[in-house]
């Protein structure tokens, strides 16, 4: 109720002679701070004096008097919350009741705590899970209702007296709720741990034995078995007998059923600890074991490999790989069931024995077409020789062989002809499915392996074909040797190297790029007139009249070809100059007179110069000289000079007559 002081602490504390006690304690007084504290041992209330009697272990008063016992007993609390106590060392006669007499200004309280001190260190307690199964991890707990700051202890785990390798986790509690030391050990027991003794040993700080607790492990496990066989090597021949025995070395709980397995499959009606096999066959070869079950599950023995020996069975051949490509490598494997394994092999190709081949595998590093055919083998061991099986077929594939391109036409071939070619070959595996031709062209293939070239070109020099299955084999190219008229006929100036001037020596060459046949004739013409029949056309001294359009022709037995027209240009200085006058050579004064310098020149005149009757240069540079207004004094002879890049030419004199106007005559 509300008139009580509130305390929290463990109900009973445990220790042993010479150890110590640490008493965690909290309180809440009814009013104000604590003024007096007395620790009694086995206090008894005296009704006469209204006080408590008993041994005073500790006393704290206002006058500060402390009994001698205070060194052993310590109050570690305070005046309002903490009431923790320590007794170090603790003695056997400290057992009993501790009374905490608390007084504040107006209130008093007696709080009792039980102390149990034994003569010797008491043992810890081992806690085990309800069931332990092999290989399943469990936690072993060792608990001791003791902990004190002034007296360090340790808990150690032992298995059959030997410290356990697994790491234990130790924890301590010194709280108002509980005081203990605990060690926890995680452990995966094996079936072999069944019945073994586990110890939790209490030791002091120096590792000195204080006390212990022990338990015997009850590890549940499947039956553990041993198998024995006669004969011991488990190797027999067909018709022999074999005995196998199953022995249980351990089972917890007891076993309930027995069975036998071959290659993992249960054998029917075999439920005893002995398996008898009479007159064994090769099919009985395999891995045998016995299986015994209990409530935990089945246990299996190790496997015994029973080998029933027999002569090789008819063989089969495996080919890696068929079909094979010519030039590749191929491996043949002879497969025959036998025990023991065959020691010798005989190989056959198309029924004929292959000399020197006695291994299980035959390796051919480079396959050729003649390697194709049927391969078979015979296996042999100590018990006999097997039969030859049906064999396997090797298919050797290769590109078409001896491919040739054949021209079907009569020779020679002329430009524009239709040419037919065929593509032939000797052998092929697989069969030829298509053909290719080089060079590519817009040509037709009227049938497989035949090419038709319509309007054959002059430059169709060689043709090659390929016959193709999975691969293409190319024939050597064949020359068509097409005959054609001369090509690219053109006129070329040999001399002079620069432009042609009047009077130069000129040579023109009739060039062509090619002709087949090579024998040719030449023809030169100008304006439809035949000039010569040589490859060159020569002019000793060219004149402007030789200028014009020239062509040359080249012909051979196939036809003739003309060049493009070539313009021969002759450069010459201005010539045939003359001065013309407009409106005429007689002009009335005051009017306009225009003098024009006319000429024939190649290139055209670039510069004109005008002169008067005294050969005085007039300041005009155009083809036309305009006098406006013309004067009578301008009457006289005028001439002009024309200049181009070749040279100069001059005109003869032309006379201009300027007459007086009627006005002038009238004034006179």
């Amino acid at each position: 109720d509300s008139s009580k002081w509130v305390f929290e602490h463990p109900e009973t504390l445990y220790a042993w002679e010479g150890a110590c006690v640490w008493i965690p304690c909290t309180y809440r007084a009814l009013d104000g701070d604590l003024e007096s504290f007395i620790l009694f041992h086995n206090p008894e209330y005296n009704k006469n004096t209204s006080k408590f009697d008993g041994t005073r272990l500790y006393e704290s008063t206002k006058d500060g008097k402390v009994p001698s016992e205070q060194k052993r007993v310590q109050f570690l609390g305070d005046k309002n919350k903490n009431c923790t106590l320590s007794i170090h060392p603790v003695h056997l006669n400290d057992s009993g009741q501790l009374g905490l007499r608390m007084e504040s200004k107006t209130e008093k309280w007696m709080e009792r705590i039980h102390l149990n001190v034994s003569e010797r260190p008491f043992p810890p307690h081992i806690q085990l899970p309800p069931e332990i199964q092999e290989s399943q991890e469990v936690t072993l707990t060792c608990l001791l209702n003791f902990s004190c700051y002034g007296y360090p202890i340790q808990l150690q785990w032992l298995l059959e007296g030997v410290p356990m390798r697994q790491a234990a986790v130790t924890s301590t509690s010194l709280t108002i709720k509980s005081v203990f030391t605990r060690s926890e050990l995680k452990f995966s027991p094996q079936w072999s741990h069944h019945g073994k003794i586990v110890t939790c040993q209490l030791q002091d700080a120096d590792g000195k034995f204080l006390s212990n607790d022990t338990v015997q492990l009850n590890v549940k496990h499947t039956p553990k078995l041993e198998i024995k066989v006669t004969p011991s090597d488990a190797i027999v021949r067909e018709g022999d007998s074999v005995t196998m025995t199953c022995e249980v070395s351990s089972s917890n709980p007891e076993y309930t059923t027995v069975s036998w397995l071959k290659d993992g499959t249960s054998l029917k009606k075999q439920n005893t600890f002995t398996l008898n096999l009479r007159e064994v066959t090769k099919d009985q070869s395999g891995k045998y074991c016995c299986q015994v079950s209990n409530d935990v599950g089945p246990g299996r023995s190790e496997e015994v490999f029973l080998q029933v020996q027999y002569a090789p069975e008819p063989s089969t051949v495996q080919i890696l790989h068929s079909p094979a490509v010519e030039g590749s490598q191929v491996e043949f494997l002879c497969m025959s069931l036998a025990n023991p394994l065959p020691t010798n092999y005989t190989w056959y190709h198309n029924g004929k024995e292959m000399q020197g081949r006695t291994e299980e595998k035959v390796h051919i590093p480079k396959i050729l077409p003649w390697h194709a055919g049927t391969y078979s083998c015979v296996a042999e061991n100590i018990l006999g020789t097997g039969q030859r099986g049906p064999g396997a077929e090797l298919d050797v594939q290769y590109p078409p062989k001896k491919v040739t391109t054949v021209i079907q036409n009569p020779m020679p071939i002329r430009e524009g002809d239709t040419v037919t070619l065929s593509c032939n070959y000797n052998s092929s595996n697989p069969s030829v499915t298509r053909y290719e031709w080089k060079p590519h062209g817009a040509w037709e293939e009227p049938s497989l392996g035949v090419l038709k070239i319509q309007n054959v070109g002059w430059d169709n020099t060689t043709i090659a074909c390929a016959a193709c299955n999975s691969w293409c084999s190319w024939a050597s190219p064949v020359a068509l040797n097409v005959q054609y008229a001369p090509r690219d006929v053109r006129v070329r100036k040999i001399k002079p190297l620069s432009e042609i001037h009047s009077g130069n020596s000129v040579s023109l060459q009739c060039d062509f790029s090619s002709s087949h046949p090579k024998e040719v004739q030449f023809f030169w013409e100008k304006n439809g007139r035949l000039l010569g029949k040589e490859s060159q056309l020569n002019f000793d001294s060219i004149s402007p009249e030789d200028a014009g359009s020239y062509s040359c022709w080249v012909n051979n037995s196939i036809g003739q070809t003309a060049s493009k027209a070539w313009t021969l240009e002759v450069l010459y200085a201005p010539r045939r100059l003359r001065v013309s006058m407009s409106p005429g050579d007689q002009v009335m004064e005051g009017k306009s007179a225009t003098l024009t310098c006319e000429s024939d020149a190649n290139p055209p005149v670039s510069h004109y110069t005008w002169f008067d009757w005294n050969n005085q240069s007039l300041p005009y540079h155009s083809q036309k000289l305009r006098l406006e207004p013309v004067k009578v004094q301008h009457s006289g002879a005028y001439w002009c000079q024309g200049t181009n890049s070749v040279g100069k030419g001059r005109s003869p004199l032309s006379t201009l007559t300027v007459y007086y106007s009627p006005e002038t005559i009238g004034r006179r």
Epitope: D612, N614, Q616, P619, Y620, K624, R626, E628, K631, G636
Partner: antibody
Framework: EVQLQQSGPGLVKPSLTLSLTCAIS??????????WTWIRQSPSRGLEWLGR?????????DYAVSVKSRITINPDTSKNQFSLQLNSVTPEDTAVYYC???????????WGQGTLVTVSS | QSALTQPASVSGSPGQSITISCTGT?????????VSWYQQHPGKAPKLMIY???NRPSGVSNRFSGSKSGNTASLTISGLQAEDEADYYC???????????FGTGTKVTVL
Amino acid sequence: EVQLQQSGPGLVKPSLTLSLTCAISGDSVSSNSATWTWIRQSPSRGLEWLGRTYYRSTWYNDYAVSVKSRITINPDTSKNQFSLQLNSVTPEDTAVYYCAREGSGSYYAYWGQGTLVTVSS
Amino acid sequence: QSALTQPASVSGSPGQSITISCTGTSSDVGGYNYVSWYQQHPGKAPKLMIYDVSNRPSGVSNRFSGSKSGNTASLTISGLQAEDEADYYCSSYTSSSTLYVFGTGTKVTVL
């Protein structure tokens, strides 16, 4: 060293005649290797060739099409000078007028100092 | 007869090179090798700088050079100097009755 000295009024009334003279020193107006030219320059028309006079075996004149009907260029051998007369002037004829000598080539190596003529009433 | 076409202005920094073009027709620039160039400072008469397309009169700096291609003539001033700031005119002989034609003029500014 050829020198050209221009003279003439700086102001002419519209419809009247503009008259300028160019006195030559260092050469003869009758030289048979030179021509004597008048050129004008205005902001609106830039440099404009007007005409020339020259002597070879006789005297010749050439005039620009734009002024052909109004222009006269005359030599004065006695004073070794040549003159420009431009009739019926309008404000459009306001410009700086230059006389210049063309030598044996078609270029002007020698120029007068220029005369600003304003046509205004 | 219309004037020859020149750019209105060209500018350059001292030491740089500039080129002024002068475009005409086959009746003037393209037809004759009688192209000349004149320099004119404000208030002064024009001064001959180049004649007959590419010839330099004595006394004119060799920094001035002329050339012609087709119907277009060019004046190049290299190593531009402050005193080169002026108006420049081209001129050509022509086959028309107006025997000479001048360019529109180019103002050269030295930055």
